[in-house]
Amino acid sequence: EAHKSEIAHRYNDLGEQHFKGLVLIAFSQYLQKCSYDEHAKLVQEVTDFAKTCVADESAANCDKSLHTLFGDKLCAIPNLRENYGELADCCTKQEPERNECFLQHKDDNPSLPPFERPEAEAMCTSFKENPTTFMGHYLHEVARRHPYFYAPELLYYAEQYNEILTQCCAEADKESCLTPKLDGVKEKALVSSVRQRMKCSSMQKFGERAFKAWAVARLSQTFPNADFAEITKLATDLTKVNKECCHGDLLECADDRAELAKYMCENQATISSKLQTCCDKPLLKKAHCLSEVEHDTMPADLPAIAADFVEDQEVCKNYAEAKDVFLGTFLYEYSRRHPDYSVSLLLRLAKKYEATLEKCCAEANPPACYGTVLAEFQPLVEEPKNLVKTNCDLYEKLGEYGFQNAILVRYTQKAPQVSTPTLVEAARNLGRVGTKCCTLPEDQRLPCVEDYLSAILNRVCLLHEKTPVSEHVTKCCSGSLVERRPCFSALTVDETYVPKEFKAETFTFHSDICTLPEKEKQIKKQTALAELVKHKPKATAEQLKTVMDDFAQFLDTCCKAADKDTCFSTEGPNLVTRCKDALA
């Protein structure tokens, strides 16, 4: 229904705390360089204004759209051009063009320092002093670094953060209580970020239809007992929610997500038998829980897929009558039978089925043509299954760090023109798939591996778009989202690449490396590994292993030495010479 004042409506629906959190996230995602204090001031002004509209919906400006109100606030910021350059030009536009302009200027890789966690004692002190400000800082810091983070989900992670601090700050050993718990939240939040970015990419590049197909497949796997009409309704609602969040309409997004959670909990009987535990939780936990609820048990009496989609004489007639509905039904029926497949694979199969019907239904004898379509799915299914087996075997043999290194070598050979920091970040993220997925039961591995890899490769594509340097990467990133992972997997050594000159300074290290945390040490070593491959793209695995073992031994020796600086300055050049010889 239409409301006289949109801002009053959202404030009433969401409540002050969530309203303020979402406005802070929205501003932080749009203007990523502003300080917390600048944004907190704007949020307070917007909240005060919302309250006046709640008191009187007819008050001045209360009838304005949220984009107009928020955009006017952002455009009133002093020194906008000095701090944000051409983003300031957005302010010369009218809505809805102004909001579109803001969206286009979101930076997926802002030049901000890594979000450093303060030490436990300091964290607990500032949390106890002012929990609201502390959580505000968290929302601001995460949102500005992840401008497409799913806003209602970020509120959930902030709530988790809050609960962990409340619990651990009361403990004697705050550090050992906080560290593992906050690491866990951080890991989950980073995965959530890349997954949501993938959804927004799908929406931005291929439109709502592409996202809705993703949602139909995913929901059908999770709720195999729900009928097609129910799945379509959920997919339509979920598409609206994600469209709003990806479009910066965070208040509407959070409000609609809460509505969707409410609907699901009120209609458990027609959706799934697994929802009750989620539905007993408070709002943020409930929506989060529903988003990752376990798959319902598949109906025992499902007929073979061939009956309606291959053997039926009416296939082409049904396809002609309503292409999207017929293909949607195919995707639903196939997905509910295959919780063991990735969504990407299911979408590839649906695409293959569509292409087959397009070709065969135009022939004089369609049934003879599409009769073999299910057999033609086989290679499409085998390819990711082999990928999972090969990579999980390698992960089990090498462990996470070694697996990351193997991926780093592979990807540096595929796209040596890509910057080393991007390659290292990508390989580290891709390598985490082992820890995340390879330990799961067999039937959960494929969906976990492939859908996670797809999300990480989406980030690779986004970073590469900013500064395109590799034709290989451009080729894989230009195609459809579901074809990206197979495209990257199929890439081989880039034969067009002219190897980098050997620069001794790239492989020169100093004693400061010894005091770095383990993660930072790994990144330094992985940076050197990528540079080695760029110097010798055709180096064998054996040669690279020799060099890296030598390098690890050098670090170990010098970091244990009494005079570290002398060790690094005398042994370092020897290491460089040995490396050159080993790779000659």
Epitope: Q313, E314, V315, C316, K317, Y319, A320, E321, E358, C361, A362, E363, A364, N365, P366, P367, A368
Partner: nanobody
């Protein structure tokens, strides 16, 4: 909504000719192969002929081969069946269908071959 409307049927003497038409709407006509099927009084549906979307490929039942010709005009979204040398056993209701369908979903047009 997919619609198929057949016309051109009637009473004809053995050895005579008729041209059936099927006007199609509600779908991308040129993307779909089309067929003619028929149902004689008291009998089941029988496939008669099929044509590809482009019109380049045609198929005929042995019983009509050499006497019937299927064709289409994609600019007019229309399917045709030219029937020559008609026989008493060609008496039936003729339906046009999409793809390989053997179910009639339209009214059909009655062809009666009788002296």
């Amino acid at each position: 909504k997919v619609q198929l409307v057949e016309s051109g049927g009637g009473l004809v003497q053995p050895g005579g000719s008729l041209r059936l038409s099927c006007a199609a709407s509600g779908f991308t006509f040129s993307s779909f192969g089309m067929s003619w099927v028929r149902q004689a009084p008291g009998k089941g549906l029988e496939w008669v002929s099929s044509i590809s979307g482009s019109g380049s490929d045609t198929l005929y039942a042995d019983s009509v081969e050499g006497r019937f010709t299927i064709s289409r005009d994609n600019s007019k979204n229309t399917l045709y069946l030219q029937m020559n040398s008609l026989r008493a056993e060609d008496t039936a209701v003729y339906y046009c269908t999409i793809g390989g369908s053997l179910k009639q979903s339209s009214q059909g047009t009655l062809v009666t071959v009788s002296s």
